[in-house]
């Protein structure tokens, strides 16, 4: 049945999320005659590309074509052949490529050039590859979750089955955690957005939204870990780093050259008397938490209120969807339930981090050790970021919903990006016939 024209009149779109740690391809589908309705686009496939993020191919760009092949071939199978030529393909690269561009614009261009060459060889309507801004990443994530939750229209079919009991018309805030950056986006209540860089105005489906957004580059979970290691090794007395964010008994050798490869560790760079150092885990949540807090500079704020590093943050308002690594990490730790209080999460993290590494390896034998070893840090980092970074409290924690998918579509920026680029979010509430519309982000 593959590659046969479908009887119903449907359209497809493809978005590749070129993240810092990996690339994922998403295929979306919608009824052609309902392009302007809210909630009609849904994800039919996610294909995770095998290998690291595209920024890691900087010294081996000729391998990018092969790297993308499997998922692009999967798209060829899923989408009927008759639809190939009219199916748009977009690639958005996020913070991993932002960091590479900071190091060298020429190297970032080289990677994107080969990505564009490779993707344009497929029979789809390739629309280009680009590094999206942190502001776009936050905005499109916010659009995605609110579109899927039916927040942009009274006509939605989802309210009866979306498991979040909330005031129907209040939008959700979006909390996105990646490997290299993290985004916070929400509509503040009657609050002036004091920093123009953090203000977005949308008119969607006949309603105006004044949205706050910020992307913290270098504060994704992987780059935050590199930052923490670079900070801690500065004051180590020798090449042994006793690290409370890793399980007791865990050992790992780190190359100093790898530590200082990223622009995120530049502020901690120091000439060290060794080329390698050894991490020895001690598994102490409280100490790990304290070490992480040193990454957040809260001593300076030129606004009425800040998150950290002098970045304006209005008072938190309403419910929040926390997705991407917020969800994956908390899901692994079994802490995504709405019923788990912040105190309970902290207590569980303390227990988890204190478990010996050998015990952890046995309990989670199917999980790659590289990932498994970092859940203690990642979980602690999530708590630190949400509580001290963004000022959630034990009470407002109840308003954080850890979301992987909504109605079968992944929460993340890709759907919002495609909706915008295909002009499928009208400014005004659609009538029975589709209206003309333009781009909003």
């Amino acid at each position: 049945t593959q590659n046969k024209a479908l009887p119903e009149n449907v359209k497809y779109g493809i978005v590749l999320d070129a993240g810092s740690s990996h690339t994922s391809l998403y295929i979306y589908k919608w009824p052609a005659e309902k392009e302007n309705d809210t909630g009609v686009v849904h994800q039919v496939e996610e294909c995770r590309v095998k290998g690291p993020g595209i920024s890691k191919f900087v010294q081996k760009v000729n391998e990018i074509g092969i790297y993308l092949t499997d998922c692009m071939e999967r798209a060829r199978e899923v989408i009927p052949r008759s639809q190939h030529q009219e199916t748009p393909v977009y690639l958005g690269a996020t913070a991993g490529m932002r960091l590479l561009r900071m190091e060298s614009e020429e190297l970032a261009d080289r990677v994107l050039d080969v990505v564009e060459r490779s993707l344009s060889n497929y029979p789809f309507d390739f629309q280009g590859a680009r590094i999206i801004t942190g502001q776009e990443e936050g905005a499109y994530g916010w659009i995605t979750i609110n579109y899927l939750l039916g927040k942009f229209s009274q006509k939605t079919r989802w309210f009866s089955i979306v498991p979040y009991e909330t005031n129907n018309q209040e939008t959700f805030g979006a909390l996105d955690l990646g490997g290299a950056s993290t985004q916070v986006t929400f509509v503040p209540q009657n609050q002036t957005i004091e920093s123009p860089d953090n203000a977005l105005q949308f008119r969607l489906y006949g309603k105006d939204y004044n949205v706050y957004t910020h992307s913290f580059l270098c504060y994704g979970k992987d780059q935050a870990l590199w930052q923490k290691l670079a900070k801690d090794i500065q004051v180590a007395s020798n090449e042994i780093l006793r690290d409370p964010c890793f399980h007791p008994g865990y050992k790992k050798v780190v190359n100093v050259s790898d530590l200082y490869k990223t622009p995120c560790t530049k502020r901690f760079e120091k000439k060290l008397p060794f080329d390698q150092f050894r991490i020895q885990g001690t598994g102490d949540y409280e100490q790990c938490h304290q070490s992480i807090l040193e990454l957040f500079n809260t001593s300076y704020c030129p606004y009425s209120q800040c998150a950290f590093n002098g970045i304006f943050l209005p008072p938190l308002q309403g419910d929040f969807g926390a997705f991407s690594a917020f969800y994956f990490v908390m899901k692994f730790l079994n802490l995504t339930s709405e019923k788990v209080s912040q105190e309970k999460v902290t207590e569980m993290m303390k227990k988890f981090c204190a478990q010996p590494w050998e015990e952890i390896k046995t309990s989670y034998a199917g999980v790659k050790e590289k990932y498994l070893s970092e859940y203690c840090f990642s979980g602690t980092y999530i708590l630190s970021l949400l509580l001290q970074g963004y000022h959630f409290t034990a009470d407002s924690w109840e308003h954080i919903h850890f979301i992987g998918k909504i109605q079968g579509s992944d929460a993340g920026w890709t759907l919002g990006y495609m909706l915008n680029l295909t002009n499928m979010i009208p400014a005004e509430q659609p009538l029975s016939t589709p209206l003309s519309h333009s781009t909003y982000v």
């Epitope: 000729n62 050039d113 564009e116 060459r117 344009s120």
Partner: antibody, heavy 120, light 113 residues
Framework: QVQLVQSGAEVKKPGSSVKVSCKAS????????ISWVRQAPGQGLEWMGG??????NYAQKFQGRVTITADESTSTAYMELSSLRSEDTAVYYC???????????????WGQGTTVTVSS | GIVMTQSPDSLAVSLGERATINCKSS????????????LAWYQQKPGQPPKLLIY???TRASGVPDRFSGSGSGTDFTLTISSLQAEDVAVYYC?????????FGGGTKVEIK
Amino acid sequence: QVQLVQSGAEVKKPGSSVKVSCKASGGTFSSLPISWVRQAPGQGLEWMGGIGFGTANYAQKFQGRVTITADESTSTAYMELSSLRSEDTAVYYCARGGAKYAGRYGMDVWGQGTTVTVSS
Amino acid sequence: GIVMTQSPDSLAVSLGERATINCKSSQSVLFSSNNKNYLAWYQQKPGQPPKLLIYWASTRASGVPDRFSGSGSGTDFTLTISSLQAEDVAVYYCQQYYLYPLTFGGGTKVEIK
């Protein structure tokens, strides 16, 4: 100053293949995206494909019939067109640039052109 | 792919007069990341390869006389020769390098009236 020097004119039979070379001098070849453009007699310019950083790509019209390669050791790019027909009679040019990222200034250096005549 | 449409097909202008060539793309070639239009203009004289005149829609390539100027954004572009000289007799092509496949306009032949 980069220069592109192409191989000489060719006369080919229908169904055969032709391989045109384009040698670069005076620049770092590995960082040059090279495009191939053809021009039939009295007609306009038509982009066939290009290569940059080891990866080639082709216009849909020529997919499966054209192969673009590059040999960094000799700073030479090649364009091979197979299953030739009379409509392939044209001047074939190589040019530096054309890619959005690596060739952001357009095609700024051109070879002198290679005339390929396909005739039985 | 993006279709490039040039007008007019040919143009006869007196020496010293202004020549204007239009180019329209079937979709925008303005790249939001850097606010640049990925459009170039070329001049081709008989028996010669094309020569780059303008890139990024309005930036003159090195050595190009300032009587040549490019303007426009998004989908509509113009090449202007402010004061036509005898050596400007040629065919002029616009080309987008925003998306693969790269595409050229059909060309505009400029002659002296």
